[in-house]
């Protein structure tokens, strides 16, 4: 066990041009606070993954009001260290996220307003017990200067805080099998402390806090005898004595989740869902207050000033859970219509519409013909996010701007001859036919099958089609 300590030295504009605007103003005084989130290993985890090594929230800094016209100076900081206790071994390699938050102190409806000013992240190697390491990180135009270290809490020592030391019981030497605790030569290595409750007869450990079972025993504390009478379970290694499969411990056997947590198996191990007030791999960390930084993903902690009063995490948009540990897939409700793409912008959802659609949810089918004129008397026809012109006779092309040959489609029936004319086409009908397209046969007695030819136009004369 031990403590990771973070000391913020300064937060202000970085070097170079384009200094950021001060986050506070005379109209809107504000103060800063910081949150640190630690994760084991060097893997680049998603920002929303839990702070598995722990998290902490600083106190609020002094109230700051910008002096009009002055550039943003280094901003006043909270007092003291940010401390993140860790229960198990220090991993040696870790990832960190440090967030700088602004608390606006104007007349806010419903209390102060919080907003994230900057977030820096990195991956580092660090041995416990070493000196303070200094660092500078930039986020946009802001610069954060800080130092950090990891130190072991007695009786743990070593670069991983896994060796345990106790004062010597005898002045001259340590007990059997135990070495002196360099550099504390007056102390001795203590035997490993296994998980609390681990059976002293049937369990052992190679790392502090674990409980490994001797053959024939199972359960999180090695208190459950393995039954060899039944060979139905597929789990576990084959028993040398019975030749059948002995049920090995399932990840949730005996419920490793403390304090009323519920266990669910995962592909590699198990996962505990903890009741409010408890967290950690096995829900073993209790008495949580806001000082412990229990809210993930930029959630802000309210209440919980002492271990007996509950804290509440106010989650930022897009996160939920008692510790803001779960990302909400707000797009899963498929709010965008007509094939639009749902975008979760954090503060809001937005739909990016396919061509031809518009509106907050892409619900409007755009008038494809709006502002699209079809030339030469053509009419616009909508459809599928594109527009099409239905052109008047004699014109063609996308916008009816191209002159077409009106006779190309052979419009004159019954062998009539087509003539292009400035106002359209004219059909010269074959004997025995009449009409604009020579579509009507002329009766033998001289009467037409349909309306008589206009005055002054004999059947067989060219008919102008207008």
């Amino acid at each position: 066990a031990g403590v990771f300590e973070l000391q913020i030295h300064s937060f202000g504009p970085g070097p170079g041009p384009g200094a950021p605007r001060s986050p506070c103003s005379a109209r809107l005084p504000c103060r800063l606070f910081f949150r640190v989130c630690l994760k084991p290993g060097l893997s680049e985890e998603a920002a929303e993954s839990p702070c598995a090594l722990g998290a902490a929230l600083s106190a609020r800094g002094p109230v700051y009001t910008e002096q009009p016209g002055a550039p943003a100076p280094d901003l006043p900081l909270p007092d003291g260290l940010l401390q993140v206790p860790f229960r198990d071994a220090w991993p040696g390699t870790f990832s960190f996220i440090i967030e700088t938050w602004r608390e606006e102190l104007g007349d806010q409806i419903g209390g102060p307003a919080w907003s994230l000013l900057a977030r820096v992240a990195g991956r580092r190697r660090l041995a416990a017990g070493g000196p303070w390491a200094r660092d500078i990180q930039r986020a946009g135009a802001w610069e954060l200067r800080f130092s950090y270290r990891a130190r072991c809490e007695p009786p743990a020592v070593g670069t991983a805080c896994t060796r345990l030391c106790r004062p010597r019981s005898a002045p001259s030497r340590c007990g059997p099998g135990l070495r002196p605790c360099a550099p504390l030569e007056d102390e001795c290595e203590a035997p490993l402390v296994c998980r609390a409750g681990c059976s002293p007869e049937h369990g052992f450990c190679e790392q502090p806090g674990e409980c490994r079972c001797l053959e024939g025993w199972t359960g999180p504390l090695c208190t459950v005898p393995v039954s060899t009478s039944s060979c139905l379970s597929p789990r576990g290694p084959s028993s040398a004595t019975t030749g059948c499969l002995v049920p090995g411990p399932g990840p949730c056997d005996g419920n490793p989740c403390a304090n009323g947590g519920s266990c669910s198996e995962t592909p590699r191990s198990f996962e505990c869902t903890c009741p409010r007030g408890f967290y950690g791999l096995r829900c073993e960390v209790s008495g949580v207050t806001c000082a412990d930084g229990p809210c993930f993903n930029g959630g802000l902690c309210v209440g919980g000033a002492d271990p007996d009063s509950a804290y509440i995490c106010h989650c930022p948009p897009g996160f939920q859970g008692s510790n803001c540990e779960k990302r909400v897939d707000r797009c899963s409700l498929q709010p965008c219509r007509n094939g639009g793409l749902c975008l979760d912008l954090g503060h809001a959802l937005r739909c990016r519409c396919r061509a031809g659609f518009a509106g907050p949810r892409c619900e409007h089918d755009l008038d494809d013909c709006a502002g699209r004129a079809c030339a030469n008397g053509g009419t616009c026809v909508e459809g599928g996010g594109a527009h099409r012109c239905s052109c008047a006779l004699g014109f063609g092309g996308r916008d009816c701007r191209e002159r077409a040959d009106p006779c190309a489609a052979r419009p004159c029936a019954h062998g009539g001859r087509c003539y292009a004319h400035f106002s359209g086409l004219v059909c010269a009908c074959a004997p025995g036919y009449m009409g604009a397209r020579c579509e009507f046969p002329v009766h033998p007695d001289g009467a037409s099958a349909l309306p008589a030819a206009p005055p002054g136009l004999r059947p067989g004369d060219p008919q102008r089609y207008l």
Epitope: L343, L345, R352, C353
Partner: antibody, heavy 121, light 107 residues
Framework: QLQLQESGPGLVKPSETLSLTCTVS??????????WGWIRQPPGKGLEWIGS???????YHNPSLKSRVSISVDTSKNQFSLRLSSVTAADTAVYYC?????????????WGQGTLVTVSS | AIQMTQSPSSLSASVGDRVTITCRAS??????LGWYQQKPGKAPELLIY???SLQSGVPSRFSGSGSGTDFTLTISSLQPEDFATYYC?????????FGPGTKVDIK
């Protein structure tokens, strides 16, 4: 560090189909936060978005190319691909693949270095 | 499709100059606009997203502003490595469309 690498033939004959693959390394193509896009740039000209695909296979195309474009994804290989049919000389361009973040704010934050495809007989 | 226009199409400037490039959308696109820098033979690189947010690692001399239809990219003090072509991209609606580009060269 995320890297995208385009691969495919640099010369395609007119009327044939152009096929390119983008291999993503240093990150998973199956993240819910990204679309994976194709953008092209004819020599000496500007940029044109071709289309984008999600790891689940959801696709958006540029309507100006839609009838000729096919985009697919292979999550097991961490790759996505572009096929453009019936190519002409006008399809000669540098083709880029890129990652578009769609959570928080939208933008193409990582690009491949591009591959020149020439359409010529 | 939303049409994007940029002005000027090219400009000549000296190291240390303040340079402003504008981009106009044919319809309102809120702040869904990015600015990209491209050097010859290289892929474009993101400078600004959401009209005014500076991409991580991009020098603070680059800034963006605007919303709706009119947007501006400003380089407060031009450096030798800034001579390149700059494109705006609207990602408000499909199809995503780029501006025609603005080439910044040495005076």
């Amino acid at each position: 560090q995320l890297q995208l690498q385009e691969s495919g033939p640099g010369l395609v004959k007119p009327s044939e189909t152009l096929s390119l693959t983008c291999t993503v390394s240093g990150g998973s193509i199956s993240s819910s936060s990204y679309y994976w896009g194709w953008i092209r740039q004819p020599p000496g000209k500007g940029l044109e978005w071709i289309g984008s695909i999600y790891y689940s296979g959801n696709i958006y195309h540029n309507p100006s190319l839609k009838s000729r474009v096919s985009i697919s994804v292979d999550t097991s290989k961490n790759q996505f691909s572009l096929r453009l049919s019936s190519v002409t000389a006008a399809d000669t361009a540098v083709y880029y693949c890129a990652r578009e973040i769609i959570v928080g704010a939208t933008h193409f934050d990582y690009w491949g270095q591009g591959t020149l495809v020439t359409v010529s007989s | 499709a939303i049409q994007m226009t940029q002005s000027p199409s090219s400009l000549s400037a000296s190291v240390g100059d303040r340079v402003t490039i504008t981009c106009r959308a044919s319809q309102g696109i809120r702040n869904d606009l990015g600015w990209y820098q491209q050097k010859p033979g290289k892929a474009p690189e993101l400078l600004i997203y959401a009209a005014s947010s500076l991409q991580s690692g991009v020098p603070s001399r680059f800034s963006g502003s605007g919303s709706g239809t009119d947007f501006t990219l400003t380089i407060s003090s031009l450096q030798p490595e800034d001579f390149a072509t700059y494109y705006c991209l609207q990602d408000y609606n499909y199809p995503l469309t780029f501006g025609p580009g603005t080439k910044v060269d040495i005076k």
